[in-house]
């Protein structure tokens, strides 16, 4: 695993303990609250950022739903299994032994249940829609410049191919950016579009998960581009499964 | 076998404009690659101008940002460089090359073409 | 920007030899590092990218290590075809791609 050699810190996860101890006094860093040693070249997987983010727990996320497929997070914050390789667990079970199903971003599809609850699969989210409101500017921005910058931003600050980029639209003042990735279109390495997200979306916050970086500071030619709301949207390759009794509610 | 083929005037008088072209072959210039610039003054080392994904997507470098376009044309399966207002430190050896991963190293290139800058 | 320093900037050596050039970035940039080969009046060869991955076609006796700050490229055995000039380059995803200065392998 890699890290900043010179100072030992994780330049793209700041809620990492890092040391001098890897392979030939090679800097290493691990993952708060999991203790997982992180690859500090790419972003730390969603499921590592929100267990080590349970030390210091702050407001949940709160989704909304565009479709019938479309999943909310309406669980907020939870402390997750995660697997040897940072992904989310198919099963969730809290302390009192409530158990439910996970996406591969790690929001719930399906009712609560006991421990005899399974899981067979972790299914992935291949399509995650991501709607900002921005500040009043004196003009609309120009779309194309938009879709460059945000096309840049994914590609500069994320390392995600803008391949996984589908579609930017813009309807003044909402901006909304597609990202899709299907399970055949992901090679090793590539990051993924939950976790590029996931950073975003903190990034938007003026929550910056990246280390000595600064804040995100989203130009469109020269004009600053001042997010004050983010809904994320999320659809999975299998449908979600609530009862009818949920759906209704 | 991915080919790569520079092709423009080997002669711009100062304060000009650089035109060149690279050819594609082997190789779409619609696949999720990047395709870039990079020159080498003679003697010297090498130096990034910038590159171009095929939807239109640009990155340059800062230090040339000001005086640089490239461009693509997909009917043609080729990219172009143009570099305005040129000096004689412009002069150097030009190459294209295919830029592979998210953010490029270059795993395919061109011969490369020399442009002198005198008028 | 980040600046990429190269040493030596000139390297003799033998055939046979075990030869080892190094590069330093100015600041971290994971592994995302590139090894080419030049020689004369021809175009860069890529040789490894992300720090140690061989490319298609290139011999084994190349190899590359390190991450952060510190990169080495190692040739195990000397060939006479490996006399040329090798160059480090970054493409860490925020910082202009940057190349080391090179360094001359020449024959002893």
């Known amino acids: 695993h890699t890290a900043a050699q010179d100072n030992c810190t994780c330049p793209t996860n700041k809620m990492t303990v890092c040391s001098p101890d890897g392979p030939g006094g090679r800097c290493q860093c691990r993952a708060l609250g999991s203790g997982v040693a992180v690859d500090c070249s790419t972003l730390t997987s969603e499921c590592l950022l929100l267990k080590a983010r349970m030390s210091a727990p702050k407001n949940a996320r709160t989704l909304v739903r565009p479709n019938e497929h479309a999943l909310v997070d309406n669980d907020g914050l939870y402390d997750p299994d995660c697997d040897p390789e940072g992904r989310f667990k198919a099963r969730q079970c809290n302390q009192t032994s409530v158990c439910w199903c996970v996406n591969s971003v790690g929001v719930r599809r399906t009712d609560k249940g006991d421990l005899s609850l399974r899981c067979d699969e972790l299914v992935r989210t291949h399509h995650i829609l991501i709607d900002l409101r921005h500040r009043p500017t004196a003009g609309a921005f120009n779309h194309s410049d938009l879709d460059a910058e945000l096309r840049r931003l994914f590609r500069e600050r994320y390392r995600l191919h803008p391949k996984f980029v589908a579609a930017v639209h813009y309807e003044q003042p909402t901006i909304q950016i597609e990202l899709r990735q299907n399970t055949s279109q992901k090679a090793a390495g590539d990051v993924d579009i939950g976790d590029a997200a996931y950073y975003f979306e903190r990034d938007v916050k003026g929550e910056s998960l990246f280390q000595g970086r600064g804040g995100l500071d989203l130009r469109v030619r020269g004009e600053p581009l001042q997010v004050e709301r983010t809904l994320i949207y999320y659809l999975d390759e299998i449908p979600p499964k609530f009862s009818m009794k949920r759906l209704t509610a | 076998q991915v080919q790569l083929q520079e092709s423009g005037p080997g002669l711009v008088k100062p304060s000009g404009t650089l035109s060149l072209t690279c050819a594609v072959s082997g190789d779409s210039i619609s696949s999720h690659n990047w395709w870039s610039w990079v020159r080498q003054p003679p003697g010297k080392g090498l130096e990034w101008i910038g590159e171009i994904y095929h939807s239109g997507i640009t990155s340059y470098n800062p230090s040339l940002k000001s005086r640089v376009t490239i461009s693509v044309d997909k009917s043609k399966n080729q990219f172009s460089l143009k570099l305005n207002s040129v000096t004689a430190a412009d002069t150097a050896m030009y190459y294209c090359?295919?830029?592979?991963?998210?953010?490029?190293?270059?795993?395919?290139w061109g011969q490369g073409t020399l442009v002198t800058v005198s008028s | 920007d980040i600046q990429m320093t190269q040493s030596p900037s000139t390297l003799s050596a033998s055939v046979g030899d075990r030869v080892t050039i190094t590069c330093r970035a100015s600041?971290?940039?994971?592994?995302?590092l590139a090894w080419y080969q030049q020689k004369p009046g021809k175009a860069p060869k890529l040789l490894i990218y992300?720090?140690?991955s061989l490319e298609s076609g290139v011999p084994s006796r190349f190899s590359g290590s390190g991450s952060g700050t510190e990169f080495t490229l190692t040739i195990s055995s000397l060939q006479p075809d490996d006399f040329a000039t090798y160059y480090c380059?970054?493409?860490?995803?925020?910082?202009?791609?940057?190349f080391g200065q090179g360094t001359r392998l020449e024959i002893k």
């Open positions: 600041q971290s940039i994971g592994n995302w």
């Open positions: 992300k720090a140690s």
């Open positions: 380059q970054q493409y860490d995803s925020y910082s202009p791609i940057t």
């Open positions: 090359a295919r830029g592979s991963g998210v953010i490029s190293y270059f795993d395919y």
